[in-house]
Interface confidence: low
Amino acid sequence: QTSVFPPEVILPRGGSVKVNCSASCDQPISLGMETPLPKKEILPGGNNWKMYELSNVQEDSQPMCYSNCPDGQSSAKTLLTVYWTPERVELAPLPPWQPVGKNLTLRCQVEGGAPRANLTVMLLRGEKELSRQSAVGEPAEVTTTVPVGRDDHGANFSCRTELDLRPYVLKLFENTSAPHQLQTFDLPATPPQLVSPQVLEVDTQGTVVCSLDGLFPVSEAQVSLALGDQKLNPTITYGNNSLSAKASVKVTAEEEGTQQLLCGVMLGNQTQETRQTVTIYSFPAPNVNLTKPEVSEGTEVIVECEAHPRAKVMLNGVPAQPPGPRAQFLLKATPEDNGRSFSCSATLEVAGQLVHKNQTRELRVLYGPRLDEKDCPGNWTWPENSQQTPMCQAWGNPLPQLKCLKDGTFPLPIGQSVTVTRDLEGTYLCQARSTRGEVTREVTVNVLSPRYE
């Protein structure tokens, strides 16, 4: 009795395997292996067994172990099964555009691969299996016909082979063809809907929206938007089977007048178009004039607003009397008017629509400098060694510079936290100075010693 181990082996093409041949008797007359494969005996063996390494196994083979024992000669075969994955898995090209509702035939060719009994060919839509067939013939050709629906647009169809060796080597080898993407389409007979401003101002931005329902597949639709000779660059938002193209448009003085706005939606090899008229106008902002933008307090100031000859203006919310393109009023400047805004609003009618423009100017009032008791107290009494912050605020426009000095040299640290010492006591002369002049004020600091508390 001759034994062989392992009795069955599955191995990759070109691989190697160790095979043990053994005899049932202790001292066989002969023990060996017959095989066309390259073999190498692995030494040392035993009295009644030998180990061989078979290499470069390219195809299925049945090496035979033989032994000659006193009770007779016998042999045993090991079954070597070679596996290799297909060399080519290819899906035939799909039509460029496929009408919804028509059947599509998928065809896959597979070259090579073994063992064929474990090789399955699948036609896939994405990862969904459409058909599973055995690989027959060389090359193996597998076909299936599938109905095409809307949900097939953009779907990837591919062909996959599975060499399932899991019962043997716990491995599943997959080869997948390059995917082919299917395109289907449906364009409705209705024209797109176009929403845009009827009037558009020179050098300003307007928004144009073009939309269309009943499109399929909406993601493949292309939109062309143009105003006169100007091509627009829309941002497209997709719904279930609708799209909306939104674009900003800016026009120049050369385009003033009426222009054609065109929206075209293209899908497959068809187009639907809509046209609309847009009036382009020029309307400069009104002018707001002050007799002087910067005046001293008490000065009289004239505020004047002037706009487009056909416009009507309002100055600080008060309409011109009589209504027209010009308005004005007079005021006496006070410190409270410093930074005050004067706003002029102009309204113009263009192609039946009212358009508005605003302009604002600011008045600067020069005043001061000032040093008031409220903001710069004349007397402070603080305990010695306490933490205090001397405060003195000067007012004016332009903002005055403030210095407080004792005996012309010792500064009072305005706005800083200090520890009160005897040195701080005394009378300080605070001086606020700006380009408009200067004011002074005396500030007395009294320090209470602990012994007087």
Epitope: E127, K128, E129, E162, R166, P167, L170, K171, L172
Partner: antibody, heavy 118, light 111 residues
Framework: QSLEESGGRLVTPGTPLTLTCTVS????????MSWVRQAPGKGLEYIGW?????SAYYANWAKGRFTISKTSTTVDLKITSPTTEDTATYFC???????????????WGPGTLVTVSS | AFELTQTPSSVEAAVGGTVTIKCQAS??????LSWYQQKPGQPPKLLIY???TLASGVSSRFKGSGSGTEFTLTISDLESADAATYYC?????????????FGGGTEVVVK
């Protein structure tokens, strides 16, 4: 990503019982799914698995006693003719993340208890 | 028939200590071995696969070693949360030989 077993209850010996594992957060078309059981106070016992393509494989001791099947979001384990020895918590588990091995189970359900008693 | 034998069946150690669990296969399974942790009332949790590779999110205090027929799981710097039953599992070969088989388990008690 989660698994949840259901269907565990008290049954009499010989009454077929089907347990269901509901998956969420991943696709059964990409993973092998295993069933493992644990008798009260005992260790884990591997029953079998179903591949992503739907082929079922069983441990030697489990052949003929269990049937594994699946839909797009569930994996079923049918105990064909329960005996008192089948009293256990049954777990479903997902494999296949590491080195493609079905048996490395990196996601488990909480388990469902089956009691077989007359 | 293929078997995985775990020793000891129970082990006790103090917090901060080290525990070693052995798993012996009845035939060579190369490095195709996983380790799982199971706490009462919970499903098992994958700790280690390929004999020594840590699964995602598992503390480096867990260390796996070995190949062929002898495997070891070492837990160092023991924490009270490590109290659980630990199982080894083979994934060599097919389900009818050694694939999927579990060891009998080792209970770790932390003092």
């Amino acid at each position: 990503q989660s698994l949840e077993e259901s269907g565990g209850r008290l049954v009499t010996p010989g009454t077929p019982l089907t347990l269901t594992c509901t998956v969420s957060g991943f696709s059964l078309s990409s993973y092998g799914m295993s069933w493992v059981r644990q008798a009260p106070g005992k260790g884990l016992e591997y029953i079998g698995w179903i591949s992503f393509s739907g082929s079922a494989y069983y441990a030697n001791w489990a052949k003929g006693r269990f049937t594994i099947s699946k839909t797009s979001t569930t994996v079923d384990l049918k105990i064909t003719s329960p005996t008192t020895e089948d009293t256990a918590t049954y777990f479903c588990a997902r494999g296949g993340d590491y080195g493609g091995s079905t048996y490395i189970l990196n996601l488990w359900g909480p388990g469902t208890l089956v009691t077989v008693s007359s | 028939a293929f078997e995985l034998t775990q020793t000891p069946s129970s082990v006790e150690a103090a917090v901060g200590g080290t525990v070693t669990i052995k798993c012996q296969a009845s035939e060579s399974i190369d490095s195709y071995l996983s380790w799982y942790q199971q706490k009462p009332g919970q499903p098992p949790k994958l700790l280690i696969y390929a004999a020594s590779t840590l699964a995602s999110g598992v503390s480096s205090r867990f260390k796996g070693s070995g190949s062929g027929t002898e495997f070891t799981l070492t837990i160092s710097d023991l924490e009270s949360a490590d109290a659980a039953t630990y199982y080894c599992q083979s994934y060599s070969g097919t389900i009818t030989t050694s694939g999927g088989a579990f060891g009998g388990g080792t209970e770790v008690v932390v003092k």
